[in-house]
C-alpha cells in the first residue's frame, strides 16, 4: 500500500545562464528509497542515484548537471531549451514507485524572477 507523498519545488523559474536546484522529497512512508531517477521533459534520463552505486550522470548532461544536494539535482548554465517538465522517480521498497513533477521556466536574464525556493543565485 503506497502511503507516501512526493513534495517538489513545483513551478520554478530561473535566469538563462544561471543554475537551479531540482528537489523532490518523499514523506509519510516507512519505505526505503533504493533509487531515484531524474528525467527531462522528453523522458531522457539526466541522472540516477542508486543507493548502493551512488550517482550516475548521463554523458549528454555531464557538463551541466551536478548531483545533489541530497537526492536533488543541480542544473547549470541554463539555456532557453531547458524550459519544460522534469520528473523525479523514487523507487522504494516495498511501496513501489513514486513520481514527482517540476516545471522549469528559463527566462532571459532581464526578466527573470527568483521564484524558486531552492534556486541558486
Amino acid at each position: 500500500m503506497m502511503t507516501g507523498t512526493i513534495e517538489t519545488t513545483g513551478n520554478i523559474s530561473a535566469k538563462k545562464g544561471g543554475s537551479v536546484i531540482l528537489q523532490c522529497h518523499l514523506s509519510s512512508t516507512m519505505a526505503q528509497v533504493t533509487q531515484v531517477n531524474w528525467e527531462q521533459h522528453d523522458h531522457s534520463l539526466l541522472a540516477i542515484r542508486n543507493a548502493e552505486l551512488g550517482w550516475h550522470i548521463y554523458p549528454a548532461f555531464k557538463d551541466r548537471v551536478a548531483p545533489g544536494p541530497g537526492l536533488g539535482l543541480t542544473l547549470q548554465s541554463l539555456t532557453m531549451n531547458d524550459t519544460g517538465e522534469y520528473f523525479c522517480t523514487y523507487h522504494t521498497y516495498p511501496d513501489g514507485t513514486y513520481r514527482g513533477r517540476i516545471f522549469l521556466e528559463v527566462l532571459e536574464s532581464s526578466v527573470a524572477e527568483h521564484s524558486a525556493r531552492f534556486q541558486i543565485p
Epitope: 500500500m1 516507512m30 519505505a31 526505503q32 528509497v33 533504493t34 533509487q35 543507493a51 548502493e52 523507487h91 521498497y93 516495498p94 513501489g96 514507485t97
Partner: antibody, heavy 121, light 106 residues
C-alpha cells in the same frame, strides 16, 4: 562475496525470549532493506516483515505484531529478530534475507542459512 | 492481501522431463513476481525476478513468463539437482509467497 550469517539454533522454554542475529558482509549494509521470513516445520515461507536499514524503522506483516521486534546495529552490519513470550507454535526456522533490486523490481537475495528456534517445555 | 496459489502442489517427474509450475495471483501484480528454489534443510535460492528475468548464474533451462495474474516457471529438461520445492513471491503490494510446489523424482 555478499553473504548473511545467522546465529545458531536455540532451544527455549515457553514464555522465554530469543534473539536471532544476522550479520551481513560484502556490501553496504544500509543500502539494502532487510527482511525476516519464518518457515514452520514442513510448511512454506511466511514473510514476517522488514526493517529499513537507513532509518531503523521496522514494518511487521500481519500476525507478527506485538511479540516480534526487528532491530539493527549498523556499526557491525547486523540485523536482529527478537521474539518474546515464546509459544510452541513459534517453533520454526527463521531466515533473514536481503532485498535486492533493479529499478522498480525487488527480490530476496542472499538469504541467511536460517536459525532453528525450538520452543518446548 | 494478495494471495498466490501455486499449482500443482506436488509434482512427480523424471530427469529430462519438461515441467511447468503455475502461480496465480488473486489480483493483478504486473510483473512483480519472483521465483525461488528450496532444497531440504537449506535456505531458499533466488532464481527469477520481474516474472521472467533470470538471476545471474541460474541455468538457462529455467525460464519464467506471465504478467498480471498468471505466471509460470518452466524447467526445460530436468536435472537431478532440480528436484526441490519451488515458491513464487509477489512484490507488488507488500509481499506474499505461494504455498510451494514440491518437485520429486518419479
Amino acid at each position: 562475496e555478499v553473504q548473511l550469517v545467522q546465529s545458531g539454533s536455540e532451544l527455549k522454554k515457553p514464555g522465554a525470549s530469543v534473539k536471532v542475529s544476522c550479520k551481513a558482509s560484502g556490501y553496504t549494509f544500509t543500502s539494502y532493506p532487510m527482511n525476516w521470513v519464518r518457515q514452520a516445520p514442513g510448511q512454506g515461507l511466511e514473510w514476517m516483515g522488514w526493517i529499513n536499514t537507513n532509518t531503523g524503522n521496522p514494518t511487521y506483516a500481519q500476525g507478527f505484531t506485538g511479540r516480534f521486534v526487528f532491530s539493527l546495529d549498523t556499526s557491525v552490519s547486523t540485523a536482529y529478530l527478537q521474539i518474546s513470550s515464546l509459544k510452541a507454535e513459534d517453533t520454526a526456522v527463521y531466515y533473514c534475507a536481503r532485498t535486492g533490486y533493479s529499478g522498480s523490481y525487488y527480490w530476496f537475495d542472499p538469504w541467511g542459512q536460517g536459525t532453528l528456534v525450538t520452543v518446548s517445555s | 492481501d494478495i494471495r498466490l496459489t501455486q499449482s500443482p502442489s506436488f509434482l512427480s517427474a523424471s530427469v529430462g522431463d519438461r515441467v511447468t509450475i503455475t502461480c496465480r495471483a488473486s489480483q493483478g501484480i504486473s510483473s512483480y513476481l519472483a521465483w525461488y528454489q528450496q532444497k531440504p534443510g537449506k535456505a531458499p535460492k533466488f532464481l527469477i525476478y520481474a516474472a521472467s528475468t533470470l538471476q545471474s548464474g541460474v541455468p538457462s533451462r529455467f525460464s519464467g513468463s506471465g504478467s498480471g495474474t498468471e505466471f509460470t516457471l518452466t524447467i526445460s529438461s530436468l536435472q537431478p539437482e532440480d528436484f526441490a520445492t519451488y515458491y513464487c513471491q509477489q512484490l507488488n503490494s507488500y509481499l506474499t509467497f505461494g504455498q510451494g510446489t514440491r518437485l520429486e523424482i518419479k
